[in-house]
């Protein structure tokens, strides 16, 4: 849940190139206005995942997950949490 | 934001070597299954892509990485 | 117009040491990961090292590992190969060869060699 | 380390006829095969890269194809200027070369 709030675009993109769905990555990718080559480009690494099927999909999800939970990307995410705060509080 | 370890991660999967991506995922997930998968991905992301489709997948991270729903 | 270079090679005795450079020209050096390869006389190619475009990953074939350091410096457009400890059999023409953006393809340009004679 | 095994080591072929060069690799490497021709004195120089792709300003006589462990190098009608060694590399895991296959005109 947490990674998905750091940048929730980059984490739809992703997970529909991964998951395969050609539909869900059109939509995911229009909400960034790109372009043609652009999303031929995204459909070349979803046909990597397609061709190497669910296992393959999986643990990339897995990989993709362990490290958005890491404490590379956790540390980071309490600190901005933390920074956040305190502009808050000097705002008021 | 999108976190450094996530960028790094991605960067790596489309501008680096098969040797350098595995390497990066073993830092945090270190089976054996998980790195020859990484490895396959790799290799095959870098037989399907150019030049300009790695440069038009960079183009979109950062579209990405500079949205506001980001 | 993609230029390689190589320079540095000589005779040296067995324990010896030598440096290689590669000069590269025509293209935008440090966008691209370069390569060591070599070849003894009358045998085929043998990949020896190869570095990343930024200079913080290194490769090496197990033949060399723990003698040879490949390194560069953008700045100059130039890559190195630093020999240590040689033998009879480091004995090969060198070569450096850049390999496609983005690791698009292994050695798509290679330099001329030079060649490197380990010998008392 | 992945051991590259190319076959035969030397063939002998009369210009126009079809050459076919192989390339065995040790364990699955995809389709991260690149073919190299070596003229005498000269420095290799890439033919095809990815199994099946044609580098640019190669001649369309010279195609590769395969995927996982066997690759195939295949040059349609041979001229005297094909002369030369031929080598396989596999990027799948760090690089190796194929011991070379040594293409002479009859």
């Known amino acids: 849940v947490k990674m998905a709030e750091t940048c929730p675009i980059f984490y739809d993109v992703f997970f529909a190139v991964a998951n395969g769905n050609e539909l869900l990555l059109d939509l995911s990718l229009t909400k960034v206005n790109a372009t043609e080559p652009e999303r031929t480009a995204m459909k070349k690494i979803q046909d990597c995942y397609v061709e190497n099927g669910l296992i393959s999909r999986v643990l990339d999800g897995l990989v993709m997950t362990t490290i958005s939970s890491s404490k590379d990307c956790m540390g980071e995410a309490v600190q901005n949490t933390v920074e956040d705060l305190k502009l808050n509080t000097l705002g008021r | 934001e999108i976190c450094p370890a996530v960028k790094r991660d991605v960067d790596l999967f489309l501008t680096g070597t098969p040797d350098e991506y595995v390497e990066q995922v073993a830092q945090y997930k270190a089976l054996p299954v998980v790195l020859e998968n990484a490895r396959i991905l790799k290799n095959c992301v870098d037989a399907k892509m150019t030049e300009e489709d790695k440069e038009n997948a960079l183009s979109l991270l950062d579209k990405i990485y500079t949205s506001p729903l980001c | 117009e993609v230029q390689l270079v190589e320079s540095g090679g000589g005779l040296v005795k067995p324990g010896g040491s030598l440096r290689l450079s590669c000069a590269a020209s025509?293209?935008?050096?440090?966008?691209?990961?370069m390569n060591w390869i070599r070849q003894a006389p009358g045998k085929g190619l043998e990949w020896i090292s190869y570095i990343s475009s930024s200079d913080d990953t290194t490769y090496y074939a197990d033949s060399v590992k723990g003698r040879f350091t490949i390194s560069r410096d953008n700045a100059k457009n130039s890559l190195y190969l630093q020999m240590n400890s040689l033998r009879a059999e480091d004995t090969a023409v060198y070569y450096c060869?850049?390999?496609?953006?983005?690791?698009?393809?292994?050695?798509?340009?290679w330099g001329q060699g030079t060649l490197v004679t380990v010998s008392s | 380390e992945i051991v590259m095994t190319q076959s035969p080591d030397f063939q002998s072929v009369a210009p126009k006829e079809k050459v076919t060069i192989t390339c065995r690799a040790s364990q699955n490497i995809g389709s991260s095969l690149h073919w190299y021709q070596q003229k005498p004195d000269q420095s290799p120089k890439l033919l095809i890269k990815?199994?099946?792709q044609s580098f640019s300003g190669v001649p369309s006589r010279f195609s590769g194809s395969g995927s996982g462990t066997d690759f195939t190098l295949t040059i349609n009608s041979l001229e005297a200027e094909d002369a030369a060694t031929y080598y396989c590399?596999?990027?799948?895991?760090?690089?190796?070369f194929g011991q070379g296959t040594k293409v002479e005109i009859k």
């Open positions: 025509g293209f935008t050096f440090s966008d691209y990961y």
């Open positions: 990815y199994a099946s």
């Open positions: 060869a850049r390999d496609g953006k983005y690791n698009t393809v292994a050695g798509d340009h």
């Open positions: 590399l596999q990027s799948y895991t760090l690089r190796t």
